[in-house]
């Protein structure tokens, strides 16, 4: 059966979110600088559960800390300024999770590094895309 237009739109939004998150991860992994060590000392909260679009609330709540860590890097590896990257991500997250639903995010007990955090959300996006295909 043909994929509905709303599903296709969701897939494209998730692809855009993936692109931004992978861009950040790519920039960090390419970052040959002592600042990388410092970046990895910052801790991020991870969702206890992330299987539905509403769980993107947990990502939204960590976008400010993410921007602060990226500002440390002052690197051209991110292709865009951290503020613009985070702004892009914020817009997409709001569209995907919807602004009407109020969802209280539950966080796991263990915190994570920026690399673990990004890997978790990239995996989440790819997983949702796969289920929509």
């Amino acid at each position: 059966a043909p994929t509905s237009s709303s599903t296709k739109k969701t897939q494209l939004q998730l692809e855009h979110l993936l692109l931004d998150l992978q861009m950040i991860l790519n920039g960090i992994n390419n970052y040959k600088n002592p600042k990388l060590t410092r970046m990895l000392t910052f801790k991020f909260y991870m969702p206890k559960k992330a299987t539905e679009l509403k769980h993107l609330q947990c990502l939204e709540e960590e976008l400010k800390p993410l921007e602060e860590v990226l500002n440390l890097a002052q690197s051209k590896n991110f292709h865009l300024r951290p503020r613009d990257l985070i702004s892009n991500i914020n817009v997409i997250v709001l569209e995907l999770k919807g602004s009407e639903t109020t969802f209280m995010c539950e966080y796991a007990d263990e915190t994570a590094t920026i690399v673990e955090f990004l890997n978790r959300w990239i995996t989440f996006c790819q997983s949702i895309i796969s289920t929509l295909t």
């Epitope: 692109l19 992978q22 861009m23």
Partner: nanobody, 118 residues
Framework: QVQLLESGGGLVQPGGSLRLSCATS????????MGWYRQAPGKQRELVAV???????NYADSVKGRFTISRDNSKDTMYLQMNSLRAEDTAVYYC????????????WGQGTLVTVSS
């Protein structure tokens, strides 16, 4: 060194057509999700079109019915056929290729400028 190289940009009149190409090294082509995004000065980056490793395509509403994304596995090249171009399509167009499994490697080109103006 892994590279993506865009070509085909230029100046075109409204209503005209252009075909962008993205040449890649084979190691980052087959099986990877690929796409085109554009960046216009002072605007949010826009994801224009995507094609999965299996050939599934997806388009932004703003280009649907006008743009067509395709890939030629034998040439390790992806294309974006742009028809009925409008002034608002003016932007730098970048192609990208991303892994769909860890370690989530991402590659993108230097971009090609498309200017739609009379």
């Amino acid at each position: 060194q892994v590279q993506l190289l865009e070509s085909g940009g230029g100046l075109v009149q409204p209503g005209g057509s252009l075909r962008l190409s993205c040449a890649t090294s084979g190691t980052i082509f087959s099986g990877y999700t690929m796409g085109w995004y554009r960046q216009a000065p002072g605007k949010q980056r826009e994801l224009v079109a995507v094609i999965s490793g299996g050939g599934d395509t997806n388009y932004a509403d703003s280009v649907k019915g006008r743009f067509t994304i395709s890939r030629d596995n034998s040439k390790d090249t992806m294309y974006l056929q742009m028809n009925s171009l409008r002034a608002e399509d003016t932007a730098v167009y970048y192609c990208y290729s991303r892994e769909v499994t860890p370690p989530w490697k991402l590659y993108w080109g230097q971009g090609t400028l498309v200017t739609v103006s009379s």
